[in-house]
């Protein structure tokens, strides 16, 4: 049989703490419990779940919860069940409500003297005790003109008057607490020698030389006294009026009338109301003058076909706010539709070619219009209108590889040679259109080309190879003056490179042909031993079928080249003394003897009194001085060639003569003596 | 060669007006786009705008509009820019330039333009 | 319009040495698969010269000890090694959309 060790037993709880049922089984065999509300099987959740056998809930909810409770015991083998006794909570909790008026049914119908009810909707269980405040102080029972129940939420006020007047709240408390009001009324019950508001002034903006009016009606009995006041608390009326608002008009109704409004007639006007009784009421009003300042430019703006693009229009700063509004070709965009406005932006939903234009953003107020144009482009991917194509471009001259193409906007074209980015420079020229200039084709520039054309909505590429035609030419050309060493084996080489390999031949310029000693052999004229006859003009003829023959023209001269039959020597010198250095070269033709000295030339012209170059080529200095010490190189030359030979000169004190030296003592070096 | 002349120097008083040219040699001002850029006394350098002289097609900086105007002469191969209502504000150097694509690799030697009372 | 920041304002270099200016974009340079970011250096009294194009391209007759770098946003301009001839002031600027613009510049000095 099944037993029931601990049974469930109804209980108190709070609302939103946790409670446990209680349920302990024993049976024979295995048994499966379960709990029933209300007979119904109860689901676990997070808040209400079994643990064991027991019932727990993390969170007591006074309508989830209410009902009874039953701890079911069942053994699935048997068919054998079980059922405890019944539970249920008593559930305590209060909740806050508002103040609200019960009676008369609307505030409207609150007059003096009549019956007043509020009704404080705090709930609770077990039923809470209620207090009511006014104006946060506490309202005890019997108090003079109310009766306050504590056992009822309702307050009545019989009969209410202006001492009653204002801001009703209530709390209230139970065994499980305490709440106040969510929500106070304002209870107002006037004076009628009070001033009350019938027709309050508003603000108005109005713009410059226009009229501006502002309504205030007061009420009281007996009927109250009603003043206007401008900023600086001058009063305004018909008799008396300020000298800035002498175009002001006080109504026998309170109406206040400014005609031909100025900047200096705006700011805040006063409405003063006062009662036989009671504070004097004050309604102000602001007088602003209307006003709109330039719209921002817009940036044209590009778009792609088939996108959707949006741009917005601020409207400029202005009072009051101005009103914004798009057109196009002058008529106002749609709230919806492919291209319409939305709030104060453009929408382009699936952008055509044909959307592209000006579109203009308007905005308006009582001040004036501001307008602000907006161009806007829509991008297509470029066309071709002429590819680049391979290309033979001649040597030297100037080539063009076209690259052509059309598209909104005016596309960009870059080109590149062998994979690299092409800069302008004095050799490669990118017209605005596209076509690539290169000055001066020279023979690597034979290589591939490739442009590319592009707008935002997409690019396109060619390219092209360039082949260059070569020129027929000399390389490198001979030099047009050369000299040959006299009774010694010589070669002048000449050689050149066309379109096809140029066949190279040398002939003397007069047409004679050359002796048997010389020979040209695959451009190279080679003497096997130079004479004096062997000068004169040659000629190099490179010439191929297709570009003809080219001519270059040697002056071939036969020398003995210099050798020095003097050179200079290592040579010290006595401070104030003479130095002679000398040095004679031969040669044919004769060669010129040039000094260097301390690496400058001495140029013969400008030597001054100490130095002089004699006519065999030897250089004296006279009266030497220390910085006159130095390498000094002899350099001779002539047409066919220059050598040169160098030497140093020391310049030293001279030496005060020792008891033990003898006259005829020699020094220890070379020396010069004069 | 490539060359872009520009004129001399010029001393404006405020509020007046001013014209500065670009001649170009070695090339063909309708085969390019040409730009003006400013440059104020040990300033950065500022983009003006630039003209397509083919067709006169231009293109300003937001804080040029109104104030700059470009204009070319294809039959003298000269761009000019036009200053008006001269501020101290406008006292700089003005240097053309020329472009084929979106480099500048050919520059004019600039106007110094000095606007004093 | 697109910012662009260069930084150092100024900056001292050993001869020799390797200087690097930076500078950045406010939004991408990129378009086309091309960086339109250009590198001019500028000597008093003279036209700017265009040292660099299209991010890392080699101006004509520009030395090679000039080299630039980066995509998108952030692009550099190193010299190495400094030279005498180096001292100037250096922009960058970008060639992607209307207004064309230009960075602050950079004074460049011998150490």
């Known amino acids: 049989a099944i037993v029931f060790i601990k049974q469930p037993s109804s209980q108190d709880a709070l609302q939103g703490r946790r409670a446990l049922l209680r349920c302990e089984v024993e049976a024979p065999g295995l048994v499966h419990v379960y709990w029933l509300l209300d007979g119904a099987p109860v689901q676990d959740t997070e808040r209400r779940f079994t643990q064991g056998s027991s019932l727990s809930f993390a969170a007591v909810d006074r309508l989830q919860d209410s009902g009874t409770f039953q701890c079911v015991a069942r053994d699935d083998v048997t068919g054998e069940e079980a059922r405890s006794a019944n539970a249920s909570f008593n559930i305590k909790w209060i909740e806050a409500g508002p103040v609200v008026l019960k009676h008369p049914a609307s505030e409207a119908e609150i007059q003096p003297q009549t019956q007043v009810t509020l009704r404080c909707h705090i709930d609770g269980h077990p039923r809470p005790t209620y207090q009511w405040f006014r104006d946060g102080t506490p309202l005890s029972d019997g108090q003079s003109n109310n009766t306050v129940s504590s056992k009822e939420r309702n307050l009545t006020l019989r009969p209410a008057g202006p001492e009653h007047s204002g801001l009703y709240s209530c709390c209230a408390h139970n065994a499980f607490g305490q709440a106040c009001s969510s929500q106070n009324f304002t209870l107002s019950i006037a004076d009628e020698s009070f001033a009350r508001v019938v027709l309050a002034p508003q603000d108005v903006i109005v713009a410059r030389n226009e009229e501006a009016m502002f309504h205030c009606q007061f009420s009281a009995q007996p009927p109250p006294n009603l003043q206007w006041l401008f900023e600086d608390e001058t009063p305004i009326t018909n008799r008396s009026r300020p000298p800035h608002l002498r175009r002001a008009t006080v109504f026998a109704n309170g109406s206040l009338l400014l005609t031909q409004v100025r900047p200096r007639n705006a700011g805040v006007y006063r409405c003063i109301g006062q009662g036989q009784r009671g504070p004097p009421v004050i309604l102000e009003a602001t007088l602003h003058l209307a006003e709109i300042e330039d719209m921002p430019l817009f940036e044209p703006r590009v778009f792609t076909a088939g996108s959707e693009e949006r741009v917005t229009c601020l409207p400029p700063k202005g009072l009051p706010e101005p009103s914004v509004w798009w057109e196009h070709a002058g008529v106002r965009l749609p709230t919806h539709g492919r291209v319409y406005q939305k709030g104060h932006e453009l929408v382009l939903a699936s952008i055509a070619e044909s959307d592209a234009g000006v579109y203009t953003c308007h905005a308006a107020n009582l001040a004036g219009q501001r307008r602000q144009d907006v161009n806007i482009t829509v991008a297509t991917v470029p066309t071709w209108l002429k590819k680049p194509q391979d290309s033979q471009l001649e040597e030297g001259k100037p080539g063009y590889l076209h690259c052509l193409t059309q598209a909104t906007p005016k596309p960009t074209v870059v080109w590149y040679r062998n994979q690299m980015l092409i800069s302008e420079d004095s050799r490669f020229e990118v017209f605005k259109n596209g076509t690539l200039r290169i000055n001066n084709v020279e023979v690597y520039d034979g290589t591939w080309y490739r442009c590319v054309s592009s707008t935002p909505a997409g690019s396109i590429e060619a390219q092209a190879r360039v082949q260059v035609l070569e020129k027929l030419k000399f390389t490198p050309p001979p030099q047009p003056q050369q000299c040959m060493e006299f009774d010694k084996e010589a070669t002048v080489p000449c050689s050149a490179t066309g379109r096809e390999k140029p066949t190279i031949k040398w002939e003397r310029a007069d047409g004679s042909s050359l002796p048997e000693w010389v020979t040209d052999n695959a451009g190279t004229l080679h003497f096997a031993r130079v004479t004096r006859d062997d000068a004169g003009n040659y000629t190099c003829i490179a010439s191929n079928g297709p570009q003809g023959q080219i001519r270059a023209h040697v002056q071939l001269t036969v020398a003995v080249f210099i050798t020095f039959k003097v050179e200079p020597e290592r040579t010290t010198v006595y401070q104030g003394h003479t130095a002679l250095l000398q040095c004679e070269a031969q040669g044919d033709p004769k060669p010129l003897i040039q000094w260097k000295g301390k690496d400058r030339i001495l140029d013969p012209t400008k030597l001054g009194p100490r130095m002089h170059i004699f006519q065999n080529g030897s250089l004296v200095i006279h009266d030497v001085a220390p910085e006159d010490s130095g390498r000094y190189t002899c350099i001779a030359g002539n047409s066919c060639n220059i050598k040169h030979t160098e030497a140093p000169l020391y310049v030293v004190d001279k030496p005060v003569p020792e008891e033990s030296e003898g006259p005829g003592s020699p020094p220890p070096y070379k020396m010069i003596q004069t | 060669q490539v060359q872009l002349q520009q004129s001399g120097a010029e001393l404006m008083r405020p509020g007046a007006s001013v014209r500065l040219s670009c001649t170009a040699s070695?090339?063909?001002?309708?085969?390019?786009?040409l730009h003006w850029v400013k440059q104020r006394p040990d300033q950065g350098l500022e983009w003006i705008g630039r003209i397509d002289p083919e067709d006169g097609d231009t293109e300003y900086a937001p804080n040029f509009q109104g104030a700059a105007t470009m204009t070319a002469d294809t039959s003298s191969n000269t761009a000019y820019l036009h200053l008006n209502s001269l501020t101290s504000g406008d006292t700089a150097v003005y240097y053309c330039?020329?472009?084929?694509?979106?480099?500048?690799?050919?520059w004019g030697q600039g106007t110094l333009v000095t606007v004093s009372a | 319009d697109i910012v662009l920041t260069q930084s150092p304002a100024s900056l001292a270099v050993s001869l020799g040495q390797r200087a690097t200016i930076s500078c950045r974009a406010s939004?991408?340079?990129?378009?086309?698969?091309?960086?339109?970011m250009n590198w001019f250096q500028q000597k008093p009294g003279q036209p700017p010269k265009l040292l660099i194009y299209?991010?890392?391209n080699q101006g004509s007759g520009v030395p090679a000890r000039f080299s630039g770098s980066g995509s998108g946003t952030d692009f550099s301009l190193n010299i190495h090694p400094m030279e005498e001839d180096d001292t100037a002031m250096y922009f960058c600027q970008q060639s992607k959309e209307v207004p064309w613009t230009f960075g602050g510049g950079t004074k460049l000095e011998i150490k």
């Open positions: 299209a991010a890392s």
């Open positions: 070695g090339f063909d001002i309708k085969d390019y786009y």
């Open positions: 939004e991408s340079v990129d378009n086309y698969g091309i960086s339109f």
């Open positions: 330039s020329r472009t084929g694509t979106r480099w500048i690799a050919y």
